[in-house]
């Protein structure tokens, strides 16, 4: 079966939007009005992985770019990066584990847990204009809850 993808934007629970910060990094900041056009549009693909009722494996690509969020070890620490891929081969149903996130839905909020590094989550800082990162704590200072907005293809 072909991989199914939907275009969406993500905002953290403080309503910060995600934008590109250089070629291989995302940052989170509050946007208004026309500046909202700067926010990154993701192509969220429904991929193979461990699945339960509230946990769905997805890959998060940047729409019309051959970039995917991936989780790798850097200096022995799980790290979020934007990784360039061959657009002829991606997206695919069986993505490598570093590209897979468990989308967890709780109380109308979404969390994205790394499949490669359980209990590590896509996170934003309370502060404005800071990088989006992979965080190993939930419920602390850093934000791990997001909302999703559909974007037409």
């Amino acid at each position: 079966a072909p991989v199914r993808s939907l275009n969406c934007t993500l905002r953290d629970s403080q309503q910060k939007s995600l934008v590109m910060s250089g070629p291989y990094e995302l940052k989170a900041l509050h946007l208004q009005g026309q500046d909202m056009e700067q926010q990154v549009v993701f192509s969220m693909s429904f991929v193979q992985g461990e699945e339960s009722n509230d946990k769905i494996p997805v890959a998060l690509g940047l729409k019309e770019k051959n970039l995917y969020l991936s989780c790798v070890l850097k200096d022995d620490k799980p790290t979020l990066q934007l990784e360039s891929v061959d657009p002829k081969n991606y997206p695919k149903k069986k993505m490598e584990k570093r590209f897979v996130f468990n989308k967890i839905e709780i109380n109308n909020k979404l969390e994205f847990e790394s499949a490669q590094f359980p209990n590590w989550y896509i996170s934003t800082s309370q502060a404005e204009n800071m990088p989006v990162f992979l965080g190993g704590t939930k419920g602390g200072q850093d934000i791990t809850d997001f909302t999703m907005q559909f974007v037409s293809s």
């Epitope: 079966a1 199914r4 939907l6 429904f46 193979q48 992985g49 699945e51 009722n53 769905i56 494996p57 989308k103 839905e105 109308n108």
Partner: nanobody, 116 residues
Framework: EVQLLESGGGLVQPGGSLRLSCAAS????????MYWARQAPGKGLEWVSR????????YYADSVKGRFTISRDNSKNTLYLQMNSLRAEDTAVYYC?????????WGQGTLVTVSS
Amino acid sequence: EVQLLESGGGLVQPGGSLRLSCAASGFTFRDYVMYWARQAPGKGLEWVSRIDPMGSSTYYADSVKGRFTISRDNSKNTLYLQMNSLRAEDTAVYYCAKPEGNFDYWGQGTLVTVSS
């Protein structure tokens, strides 16, 4: 065998309303997020709306926000899409789907034509 069977499509005038239904069988409907998607003639697939298993969380494409309402009745294994203030650009084949997870299920679709 999993089945998703849409009904309720047809010809309607601009400004009119339709209610689409999708009868699900062969899987535990109440456990899954469900979607409505559509494909207009000569266009790509557009995600219209999404609803969580309990019906408490919904999403809509900007193009239908405020006009369409997704709902579900888990006791009847049925998904609904109430479409109001229909426009010519809503003309499409509408699909009921469970795209999330390792197995994605799709209905055959029901045609909605908005024309005077």
